[in-house]
Interface confidence: low
C-alpha cells in the first residue's frame, strides 16, 4: 500500500480581516494510526493552532467529523481572522507512539494572507505658517494596511498633485503596513479657502477611497497691502486720514499710528470684512485736529500682523500757510479724535 | 488618456498555451489592478482574476486558478496572461481592464483578443 | 460567488418608447460602508463593455440622463426613459461588493 501523503491543495488563501479562513488538509491513507496537528510556521519555534487529540481551540472549528470513521479530510476553519493570523500553516500528521506520538508526515503549508483596511488617513500640515509662493508640506499617514499593495494620490482642489514622496513599511514580509506620504504645495495668495486631500485605495476599500483632508488656511499667512490716503475735510481744521489694511489673513493684528514718529493710538481689528478668497480687509481713521501743528505731519500706519516683523506706510499731511499762521493761538486739547466711520 | 492595447486575435492549436497582452499607456502602470475578463462566443462576461503591477500579486477566481497564469513586464508597462491546456470550450475573446483609485473600476478596458482554439 | 440574474434576456423596443432591465443578485450587495457596488455596462456590438453607471445610480460622464439606475439590496433596475438607435447592445449588471466580482448574463437590447 502506498505511503501516507498529506495534502494542502492551496498555496495561499486571502481572507479579509473579521472573515473566517478554511485552511484545507486532507490524508490518501488511514495508516499509520495517529492524530493530526496543525501549526503555523516551521520548525522548532511553531504555534500549535489545532490538535485533533486534545486542547481548547475556541476560535477553530473542524471542516468535516473527525471521529468519523475512515474520515480523510482535516481542513480546519479559523474564525474573526487579524493581520496577526497571517503566515504559513501546516498540516501535520503523527504516528502513534509511546510514550508519545511522533511526527510522521507534514503537508507543503498554506500561506494565509490578510486583506486588511488602511485606518483613516491623517493630513498634517505644518507647524508654522508660510507666505504665498513658498512651499509647504503637507504629511499623510495610514497603519494597518494588508496586503501591502495600496495607491496614494495627492490632490489640492480637486487638481492631483505630482510633487511627493511615498514609503510604505517595513519594506519586507509583515503581518500588517504603514504608509507615510509627504507632499510639497506651493501656495497661492487664493490658498485660505484650498483643501490638500490624501486619497488612499486599497483592494479592501472596494473601489470607494479613503481620504484625509487638510485645509491651508492653517497652513497660510497673507500679509497685509497698506494704503494710507486722506479724505475730504469733515470741518476745516480737522483732516481725516485712514489705513486701508488690505487682503490678510490670519485674523490676528494690531495697527498703531504714529504722528512724526510718536505713538498716537493702537488698536486691535476686531470688526473685519471678510474678502471671497478669505483673506480681510480692515480700515482705521486717524482724525487729526491740524490747528494743533504748525508744521507738516508725517503719519505713519505701522501694522503688526500674526507676530510678525511690522510693516508701514507713511503720508505726509501738509498744514496750509493760514493754518500755520494762527496755529501759535491753538492749543493741543484735541490733536486725536477717536477713529469713527466717515 | 488611458489605453489598454491587446492584440486583435491568436489562433492555438488543442493542447497548446498562449500568452495574451495588454499594454498599458497613459498613466502610472505599476499603481492600479489589471483584471482580466473572459467573453465566450455569444456569451456574456466572466471575471478571470487581477494582478497588481508593482508586487506582481495576483488572485484569480477558482474557475481560472488551473487556466490562467497572470504575470507582468513594468519595463514595457504590460501585462500578460498565459492560458495553458487550450480546448476548443477555451475559444473567447479576452479583455483586460483597469481599476481606478476612486468608483472607477471596470471603466477602463482593452479591445479585447479574439483566441480561437482549433486543430 | 455572488449570482447576478439579468431578465428579460432580450428587450424589444421602438425608438423613443421606454425600457426597463431588471438585475438581482444572490446576496446582498450592500457594503459594511453603507454603499452599494453595483455597475451597469454596455456593449455595442463589436465593441468593448462601456461603464454606463455606478454605485447603483451615478451616472458617467457623458451618459445621456435618458439612463437611470435604482435599486437596492438585491433588486436593481435600468431604465431608458426613450430608446434611442445608439442604445442598443448587450447591457450587464456586475458587482464589486463581494470577492470574485460576478457579471450578469447580459440582456440584449433590439430596435423594433
Known amino acids: 500500500e502506498d505511503e501516507l501523503q498529506v495534502i494542502q491543495p492551496e498555496k495561499s488563501v486571502s481572507v479579509a480581516a473579521g472573515e473566517s479562513a478554511t485552511l484545507r488538509c486532507a490524508m490518501t491513507s488511514l495508516i499509520p494510526v495517529g492524530p493530526i496537528m496543525w501549526f503555523r510556521g516551521a520548525g522548532a519555534g511553531r504555534e500549535l493552532i489545532y490538535n485533533q487529540k486534545e486542547g481548547h481551540f475556541p476560535r477553530v472549528t473542524t471542516v468535516s467529523e473527525l471521529t468519523k470513521r475512515n474520515n480523510l479530510d482535516f481542513s480546519i476553519s479559523i474564525s474573526n481572522i487579524t493581520p496577526a493570523d497571517a503566515g504559513t500553516y501546516y498540516c501535520v500528521k503523527f504516528r502513534k507512539g509511546s510514550p508519545d506520538d511522533v511526527e510522521f508526515k507534514s503537508g507543503a503549508g498554506t500561506e494565509l494572507s490578510v486583506r486588511a483596511k488602511p485606518s483613516a488617513p491623517v493630513v498634517s500640515g505644518p507647524a508654522v505658517r508660510a507666505t504665498p509662493e513658498h512651499t509647504v508640506s503637507f504629511t499623510c499617514e495610514s497603519h494597518g494596511f494588508s496586503p501591502r499593495d495600496i495607491t496614494l494620490k495627492w490632490f489640492k482642489n480637486g487638481n492631483e498633485l505630482s510633487d511627493f514622496q511615498t514609503n510604505v513599511d517595513p519594506a519586507g514580509d509583515s503581518v500588517s503596513y504603514s504608509i507615510h506620504s509627504t507632499a510639497r504645495v506651493v501656495l497661492t495668495r487664493g490658498d485660505v479657502h484650498s483643501q490638500v486631500i490624501c486619497e488612499i485605495a486599497h483592494i479592501t476599500l472596494q473601489g470607494d477611497p479613503l481620504r484625509g483632508t487638510a485645509n491651508l488656511s492653517e497652513a497660510i499667512r497673507v500679509p497685509p497691502t497698506l494704503e494710507v490716503t486722506q479724505q475730504p475735510m469733515r470741518a476745516e481744521n480737522q483732516a481725516n486720514v485712514t489705513c486701508q489694511v488690505s487682503n490678510f489673513y490670519p485674523r490676528g493684528l494690531q495697527l498703531t499710528w504714529l504722528e512724526n514718529g510718536n505713538v498716537s493710538r493702537t488698536e486691535t481689528a476686531s470688526t473685519l470684512i471678510e474678502n471671497k478668497d478669505g483673506t480681510y480687509n480692515w480700515m482705521s481713521w486717524l482724525l487729526v485736529n491740524t490747528c494743533a501743528h504748525r508744521d507738516d505731519v508725517v503719519l505713519t500706519c505701522q501694522v503688526e500682523h500674526d507676530g510678525q516683523q511690522a510693516v508701514s506706510k507713511s503720508y505726509a499731511l501738509e498744514i496750509s500757510a493760514h493754518q500755520k499762521e494762527h496755529g501759535s493761538d491753538i492749543t493741543h486739547e484735541a490733536a486725536l479724535a477717536p477713529t469713527a466711520p466717515l | 488618456q488611458v489605453q489598454l492595447q491587446q492584440p486583435r486575435a491568436e489562433l492555438v492549436k488543442p493542447g497548446a498555451s498562449v500568452m495574451l497582452s495588454c499594454k498599458a499607456s497613459g498613466y502610472t502602470f505599476s499603481s492600479y489592478w489589471i483584471h482580466w475578463v473572459r467573453q465566450g462566443p455569444g456569451q456574456g462576461l466572466e471575471w478571470i482574476g487581477l494582478i497588481h503591477p508593482n508586487s506582481g500579486n495576483t488572485d484569480c477566481s477558482e474557475t481560472f486558478k488551473n487556466k490562467a497564469t497572470l504575470t507582468v513586464d513594468t519595463s514595457s508597462s504590460t501585462a500578460y496572461m498565459q492560458l495553458s491546456s487550450l480546448a476548443s470550450e477555451d475559444s473567447a475573446v479576452y479583455y483586460c481592464?483597469?481599476?481606478?483609485?476612486?468608483?472607477?473600476?471596470?471603466?477602463?478596458w482593452g479591445q479585447g483578443t479574439l483566441v480561437t482554439v482549433s486543430a | 460567488d455572488v449570482v447576478m440574474t439579468q431578465t428579460p434576456l432580450t428587450l424589444s423596443v421602438t425608438i423613443g418608447q421606454p425600457a426597463s432591465i431588471s438585475c438581482k443578485s444572490s446576496q446582498s450587495l450592500l457594503y459594511t460602508n453603507g454603499k452599494t457596488y453595483l455597475n451597469w455596462l454596455l456593449q455595442r456590438p463589436g465593441q468593448s463593455p462601456k461603464r454606463l453607471i455606478y454605485?447603483?445610480?451615478k451616472l458617467d460622464s457623458g451618459v445621456p440622463d435618458r439612463f437611470t439606475g435604482s435599486g437596492s439590496g438585491t433588486d436593481f433596475t435600468l431604465k431608458i426613459s426613450r430608446v434611442e438607435a445608439e442604445d442598443l447592445g448587450v447591457y450587464y449588471c456586475v458587482q464589486g461588493t463581494h470577492f470574485p466580482r460576478t457579471f450578469g448574463g447580459g440582456t440584449k437590447l433590439e430596435i423594433k
Open positions: 481592464a483597469r481599476d481606478g483609485a476612486s468608483y472607477d473600476w471596470f471603466v477602463h
Open positions: 454605485l447603483v445610480s
